[in-house]
């Protein structure tokens, strides 16, 4: 009698290897015979595709290589004809070893950076990655993990995090390892010993030393107001990655020296520069004109402090002007990392308008000189306690560096606005800012001896600087 | 790119006033830093300066012509002028209008290419 | 007016080195510039603030100045240097000189 058909085992969870033969099976009782067709994922699987074997008529559907993409719902239909289609599905897992499809290479990073080895898996079940450092399995911290992808990540890279790294992908088919690979951590060149400023008697000799360090170890260079100094008179040493180099001189006139440390990232350098002056005791430079030109302020230290759309003078007695100048704020303007939050940026304001003077619209370049006033409120009441501070040290000879010597107005020597209102210079000023906290206080709210000046907007107008300063 | 450009009388008699024109363009005559120069060149001999005006408009002169030098400007016109007096053969020269700026130590970094002027009767 | 002393003539041979000096009272305290004229054009500006080349000169243009000589260096002289030379400072008063002017001839 003709019977409708019935699956007498329905299909289950198959799971196989790739590479390995995996198998579903349909039993039909029906009479007729039925037709069992093959779906996966609910598309037809057809009797040709030369990667099944359909047996046993249509009963048995074997895949002869499995492969990770044949994963899927697998369905079989029988239908004779007699009543309904019926249908049973299951699921095909693919198994898989542990695989490193996109392991980690060697990486060179800067300190301070973000570094992150690859290490990409497949497999089934998902394996976990883990990470060896040299012998031994790698410790999470605040500043390294294993990121969902299985990379490495670590945060603010230090000099300690270099070595050889490997990662591990495991499951319960087996565990598969990366090659070795090398993280080399750069640092930026850095001036562990600053030379130190010398006054001394004409035809002394000076050594001038200057220490750095970073990874590659640096070379040093020194300049001599500008200009290159021959190797001849300088001995350097390399020592567990810092470099100690002096410099020999025969004084017969003041200079600047800088000594510059460099070192290269790849197609990159970074550069670390510190700068003494050597000075002559009794030395009277025979005066000379205003020689110079004048620029766009190029530098950095004082980018926030000059106005921006003016020139200033560039004074070509230094061989490189802008350097030499940019160098002679730099050296002040960490001595004033130091001072009170009041006389800093009223100092920094000063300093960089004395050093980088505005240049006179005039028919020949010449420099503005800051107007009396504003050098004396500066001096009198912004850092009254740090300038007495400072000119005691200078008269009894204690300051470390006599480059403030060179940075440093006589405010007496200034012109008065009062004379001609256009032969001096003002400090840059802005109209008091509640979000820029680096303010003047008001003029007006204290009663200097110095004839502050009247700022051009109204009387609760303050002085204000805001600077930004990054150098390496 | 500033350029600039002299002209005026090829041609001027003596005891007369010889006047040129100097036209500015791809920059204005009253920007700072900026100043505007009369030099020139007697035939077979070198440069020689006669004076200048500044963005502002204050003119100076070479000491040795100042009694008959005069320059002056025309800024709607962005053009410099120079008068000068009781002309003589000596005064014959090619005439030069150039820039002075003080971004190369107030050199003159720009010039016309200058206007023959004879004085002759 | 302040007094700018060049000697007339130089010669140089193709390649060598040119000097060209100019003489004046501690010159060395003051700003020297140097134009180049060939025949029949306009000065052109090769060096500035004694030393400093504007862009588009080559760097075989160099300056110095010192004491009271400036100096106009030409290193390897080519052909195409061949021309007038001629200093100029400006004085305190806002008056500028020029020096006589040296003719370089390229052997």
């Known amino acids: 009698l003709p019977k409708a058909p019935v699956i007498t085992t329905p299909l289950e969870t198959v799971d196989a290897l790739v590479e390995e033969v995996a198998t579903f099976m349909c039993a039909v009782e029906s009479y007729p015979q039925p037709e069992i067709s093959w779906t996966r994922n609910k598309i037809l699987i057809k009797l040709f595709d030369t990667r099944y074997s359909i047996r046993e008529n249509g009963q048995l559907l074997t895949i002869l290589s499995v492969e990770d993409s044949d994963d899927g719902i697998y369905c079989c239909t029988a239908n004779n004809g007699v009543g309904g289609a019926v249908e049973s599905c299951g699921a095909l897992q693919v198994k898989m070893k542990p695989k490193i499809t996109r392991p980690p290479i060697n990486v060179k990073i800067i300190e301070g950076l973000k570094a992150v080895l690859p290490c990409t898996t497949m497999g089934n079940p998902k394996p976990s990655v883990s990470w060896i450092k040299g012998d031994s399995p790698l410790r999470e911290n605040s500043r390294t993990a294993v990121l969902e992808s299985g990379s490495l990540r670590i945060h603010n890279v230090q000099k300690e995090d270099a070595g050889q790294y490997r990662c591990v992908a495991k499951n319960s088919l087996g565990t598969a390892y990366s090659k070795v690979v090398k993280l080399e951590v750069e640092v930026f060149a850095r001036i562990l010993r600053a030379p130190e400023s010398h006054n001394v008697t004409f035809g002394s000799f000076v050594t001038l030393h200057c220490t750095a360090t970073g990874i590659p170890v640096p070379t040093i260079t020194w300049i001599e107001n500008g200009n290159a100094v021959s190797s001849g008179s300088i001995q350097e040493s390399v020592k567990d990655r810092v470099i100690d180099s002096r410099l020999q001189l025969f004084i017969t006139k003041p200079g600047l020296y800088t000594c510059i440390a460099t070192n290269k990232h790849g197609e990159k350098f970074s550069t670390a520069k510190a700068a003494a002056t050597v000075s002559i005791a009794e030395w009277s430079k025979p005066q000379k004109d205003n020689k110079g030109y004048c620029a766009q302020y190029r530098g950095e230290v004082c980018n926030a402090v000059l106005a921006k759309d003016a020139l200033v003078f560039l004074n070509t007695s230094y061989a490189d002007p802008e350097e030499a100048q940019e160098l002679l704020v730099h050296t002040a303007w960490n001595e004033l990392k130091v001072v009170s939050p009041l006389c800093r940026p009223a100092a920094e304001a000063l300093l960089c308008n004395h050093v980088f003077q505005e240049c006179s619209p005039g028919v020949v370049p010449t420099p503005i000189p800051i107007c009396r006033e504003y050098c004396l409120a500066v001096k009198e009441l912004f850092c009254a306690k740090e300038w007495l501070a400072m000119e005691e040290k200078t008269h009894r000879g204690l300051y470390r560096s006599e480059m403030h010597l060179l940075s440093v107005p006589e405010c007496s020597k200034l012109p008065s606005m009062h004379w001609d209102p256009t032969a001096c210079a003002r400090l840059p000023h802005l109209d008091y800012n509640k979000e820029n906290p680096k303010t003047f206080p008001p003029m007006t709210s204290s009663k200097p001896s110095v004839d502050i000046p009247n700022l051009p907007s109204s009387s609760s107008s303050s002085f204000s600087v805001s600077p930004t300063y990054s150098m390496t | 790119q500033v350029q600039v450009q002299e002209s005026g009388p090829g041609l001027v008699k003596p005891s007369q006033t010889l006047s040129l024109t100097c036209t500015v363009s791809g920059g204005s005559i009253t920007a700072r830093y900026y100043s505007w120069s009369w030099i020139r060149q007697p035939p077979g001999k070198g440069l020689e300066w006669m004076g200048v005006i500044a963005y502002d408009g204050s003119t100076y002169y070479s000491p040795s012509l100042k009694s008959r030098t005069s320059i002056s400007r025309d800024t709607s016109k962005n053009q410099f002028s120079l008068h000068l007096s009781s002309v003589t053969p000596d005064d014959t020269a090619v005439y030069y209008c150039?820039?002075?700026?003080?971004?190369?130590?107030?050199?003159?970094?720009?010039w016309g290419q200058g206007t023959q002027v004879t004085v002759s009767s | 007016s302040y007094e700018l002393t060049q000697s007339p003539s130089v010669s140089v041979a193709l390649r060598q080195t040119a000097k060209i000096t100019c003489g004046g009272n501690r010159i060395g305290g003051k700003s020297v510039q140097w134009y180049q004229q060939k025949p029949g054009q306009a000065p052109m500006l090769v060096i500035y603030a004694d030393s400093r080349r504007p862009s588009g000169i080559p760097e075989r243009f160099t300056g110095s100045n010192s004491g009271n000589t400036a100096t106009l260096t030409i290193t390897g002289a080519q052909a195409e240097d061949e021309a007038d030379y001629y200093c100029h400072v400006w004085g305190s008063t806002a008056s500028a000189d020029f020096g006589g002017g040296t003719h370089l001839t390229v052997l």
């Open positions: 150039a820039r002075g700026s003080s971004r190369v130590a107030a050199a003159f970094d720009s």
